[in-house]
Interface confidence: medium
């Protein structure tokens, strides 16, 4: 093999190259030196590098590596960030539409209930939004609160409209009676089942996307070890010390170095693959009662059916409640107010099913397909980075970390590096703590995704019957019990054309009792959860 050419006597070439990295500083020797103080670019003869230059090269090499890693993950990162934002906003839009449909149902069918109903509906859907975003709210409590609040109004306005003002002190009793007498039949339980299943899946879907971003962000901002910095310096910069400015590293050598540097990151691969496949499984199961769009946009109809159920049994109920709540204590009636702005367009709500709309469901599947093209992202990283940094083609006339070689031999390179640095040791060190943490988070989300009670294939949720739903409450297929009937009812069959909606300002609905603007209740931690961070002052 040809001996490496000596650097020029004045180290001019090396100096001019180094000046680009570190302008102004005179760290380059004036003439080639023995370089006995060097620790990375161990010379075989005189060198134009100093210890200070070596340190600068190491720093630059690590920065280069970080930039390469960031550019490698840019497309994937953008894909997940964009979709997480799109879905979060789309879910907000679904919630807003569902709220408006429900308000419209009350306005069209039960105008006497509207002031209070709007308020209760608004609170319910605000909680739905917060739940999706991760708030610690119990779905059953949300549904119970909705029906608990609605019943006193239904009783006093629809069933007993002649009730004198003095009788309005029975609210608490009516709230209690609502559950005890099952005045809405099994509709509340049905809604609980549908809403909790669909929201749970929606919430974990968003959680998983956000974790995906966290995974990429973590690996994106990894700080590479000093050992890795030395290997990179040897590969990219030590050739400069010998005046070899135009020579490129050998491709095979680059792969060895990258696998060493990325050993920890590559450990994510197994869990990343599982993450994408588990997410795919989740998405495949997001239909019917596991699809919040389907469930929430049909809620108005189920609520309407539930009120009709009450009206059907009004005679019997009025008698029972008359006895039960005769001696309630005085209690002021809850104040109610009209929202300023309902944004209800009856024409829009009457729209029939529109074919070929882009639905949330198709968007989810599209995302999964794109994500699957990144399933080998972590295992392929070393190769990707080498292919996107300068390496010699065909491993001919290239730099192997010590010298210029005609052909790269991994064995020779390893032998030559033994006394400098052990690649095997680097691999054995295990992943960085941040990588271990992100692996733990991936394991956790994968477990959550796997354990979600999702429908396997097209199985009807007949177990709802076992939970005590009366067949008369809905149609034959309980989990499709969403699009109720009733004269003058609005049929909502079409899925949201949510992408068109995204341009629509989410905060337009900001009227009292109708507000979907997230207030800081989505700060989903409480003081008493925080106490884990410090000694617990709880009594």
């Amino acid at each position: 093999q040809p001996p490496p050419p000596p650097p020029d006597a004045t180290c001019h070439q090396v100096r001019s190259f180094f000046q680009r990295l570190q302008p102004g500083l005179k760290w380059v020797p004036e003439t080639p030196v023995p370089g006995s103080d060097l620790q990375v670019c161990l010379p075989k003869g005189p060198t134009c590098c100093s210890r200070k230059m070596e340190e600068k090269y190491q720093l630059t090499a690590r920065l280069n590596m970080e930039q390469l890693l960031q550019s490698a993950s840019m497309e994937l990162k953008f894909l997940i960030i964009q979709n997480a934002a799109v879905f979060q906003e789309a879910f907000e839009i679904v919630v807003r539409h569902a709220k408006n449909y429900t308000n419209a149902m009350f306005k069209n069918n039960y105008p006497s209930l509207t002031p209070q109903a709007f308020e209760f509906v608004g609170e319910f859907f605000t909680d739905v939004s917060l739940y999706i975003l991760g708030s610690d709210i119990n779905v059953d409590d949300m549904v119970n609160e909705l029906f608990d609040s609605l019943f006193p109004v239904i009783y006093t306005q629809l069933m007993n409209p002649g009730l004198p003002d003095s009788a309005l002190d029975i609210n608490e009793c009516l709230r209690g009676a609502r559950r005890d007498l099952k005045v809405f039949g099994n509709f509340p339980k049905l809604i609980m089942t549908q809403v909790s299943k669909s929201l749970q899946v929606t919430r974990i879907f968003l959680q998983a996307l956000n974790l995906g971003i966290e995974v990429i962000n973590t690996t994106d901002h990894l700080k590479f070890s000093k050992d890795c910095g030395r290997m990179l310096t040897r590969m990219w910069y030590c050739s400069y010390c010998q005046g070899l400015m135009m020579v490129k590293p050998c491709g095979g050598y680059c792969n060895v170095v990258m696998q060493g540097c990325m050993a920890g990151v590559v450990e994510i691969d197994k869990y990343w693959r599982e993450y994408i496949l588990s997410l795919e499984e989740l998405v495949n199961g997001m239909y019917r009662i596991y699809d919040m769009e389907n469930v929430l946009l049909g809620l108005f109809s189920t609520i309407h059916d539930s009120i009709q159920y009450v009206q059907k049994n009004a005679g019997k109920l009025t008698t029972t409640i008359g006895k039960l709540c005769a001696h309630s204590q005085q209690r002021q009636y809850r104040s109610a107010y009209y929202p300023e702005d309902l944004f209800i367009d009856k024409k829009v709500l009457k729209v029939a099913h529109v074919e070929h709309e882009e639905t949330l469901s198709s968007r989810r599947r599209e995302l999964i397909q794109k994500l699957k093209s990144f399933i080998s992202f972590y295992s392929a990283l070393p190769g990707y980075i080498c292919s996107h940094s300068p390496v010699a083609e065909n491993d001919t006339l290239c730099w192997n970390g010590q010298e210029l070689v005609e052909r790269y031999s991994q064995k020779a390179a390893r032998n030559g590096m033994k006394n400098q640095f052990n690649l095997h040791e680097l691999k054995m060190k295990g992943p960085e703590p941040v990588v271990s943490q992100i692996i733990d988070k991936l394991k956790h989300i994968n477990q959550l995704l796997r354990t979600m009670s999702m429908p396997k294939g097209r199985v009807l949720d007949k177990n709802l019957d076992e939970e005590g739903f009366e067949s008369g409450d809905c149609g034959d297929d309980e989990d499709e019990c969403i699009g109720g009937s009733g004269d003058g009812m609005i049929k909502v069959k079409n899925q949201l054309r949510f992408l068109a909606e995204l341009a629509y300002d989410l905060d337009v609905d900001d009227a009292p009792g109708n507000s979907q603007q997230a207030t800081p209740k989505d700060n989903e931690i409480s003081t008493f959860h925080n106490l884990g961070n410090v000694h617990s002052p709880l009594k």
Epitope: E214, N523, I525, T527, N530, N533
Partner: antibody, heavy 115, light 112 residues
């Protein structure tokens, strides 16, 4: 809408105790923590502690432990802070504020400790 | 306790100017759930503090869009793009992640 109504100004003697009240309106009292904050020109805003009216759980700043006692009455949707062994250092405006993020505050109660 | 350091103490501005207030915490305010619990408030003389921004950058309802918050970990900034007369008062930052919760010392925004 959400409102927190605090009791009026208090002028008290050193060594005495005072019980401040904070009535919650416009939301479900038991769903949110109520926090108390002290404000003086010297120390600025200081977090005293919090109570969860639903569970009765309390958390205190060590600096105010033994000085402040937080309670809540669910039936009247009112939170209370009893402040004992008063000294001139305790002259301040005391606020109740609803977690999360302290989006809603009472109007404040001025306590003046003077012989 | 987590110390919240606000700078400057006083900020004289002309109406229509941009104002920027800094808040630094002695520990990272990132919770294990990924959220950063840093709030900004405005207190006008004789009034209670009013929430402007929560979780670093989220504007509370009714807060004009000239108010914006940014930052991460331990360094945070509140910006007012065009100061109006109604914006004058004392601005506080606070953290609600470590008990005891703590507030910054305040920055007084006043007319030059």
């Amino acid at each position: 809408q959400v409102q927190l109504q605090q009791s009026g100004t208090e002028l008290v003697r050193p060594g005495a105790s005072v019980k401040l009240s904070c009535k919650a309106l416009g939301y479900t009292f038991t769903d949110y923590e109520m926090h108390w904050v002290k404000q003086t020109p010297v120390h600025g805003l200081e977090w005293i502690g919090a109570i969860h009216p639903g569970s009765g759980d309390t958390a205190y700043n060590q600096r105010f432990k033994g000085k402040a006692t937080l309670t809540a009455d669910k039936s009247s949707s009112t939170a209370y802070m009893e402040y004992s062994s008063l000294t001139s250092e305790d002259s301040a405006v005391y606020y109740c504020t609803r977690f999360y993020s302290y989006a809603y505050w009472g109007q404040g109660t001025l306590v003046t400790v003077s012989a | 306790d987590v110390v919240m350091t606000q700078t400057p103490l006083s900020l004289p501005v002309s109406l229509g100017d941009q104002a920027s207030i800094s808040c630094r915490s002695s520990q990272s305010l990132v919770h294990s759930n990924g959220n950063t619990y840093l709030q900004w408030y405005l207190q006008k003389p004789g009034q209670s503090p009013k929430l402007l921004i929560y979780k670093v950058s989220n504007r509370f309802s009714g807060v004009p869009d000239r108010f914006s918050g940014r930052g991460s970990g331990t360094d945070f900034t509140l910006k007012i793009s065009r100061v109006e007369a109604e914006d004058l008062g004392v601005y506080f930052c606070s953290q609600s992640i470590y008990v005891p919760y703590t507030f910054g010392g305040g920055t007084k925004l006043e007319i030059k």
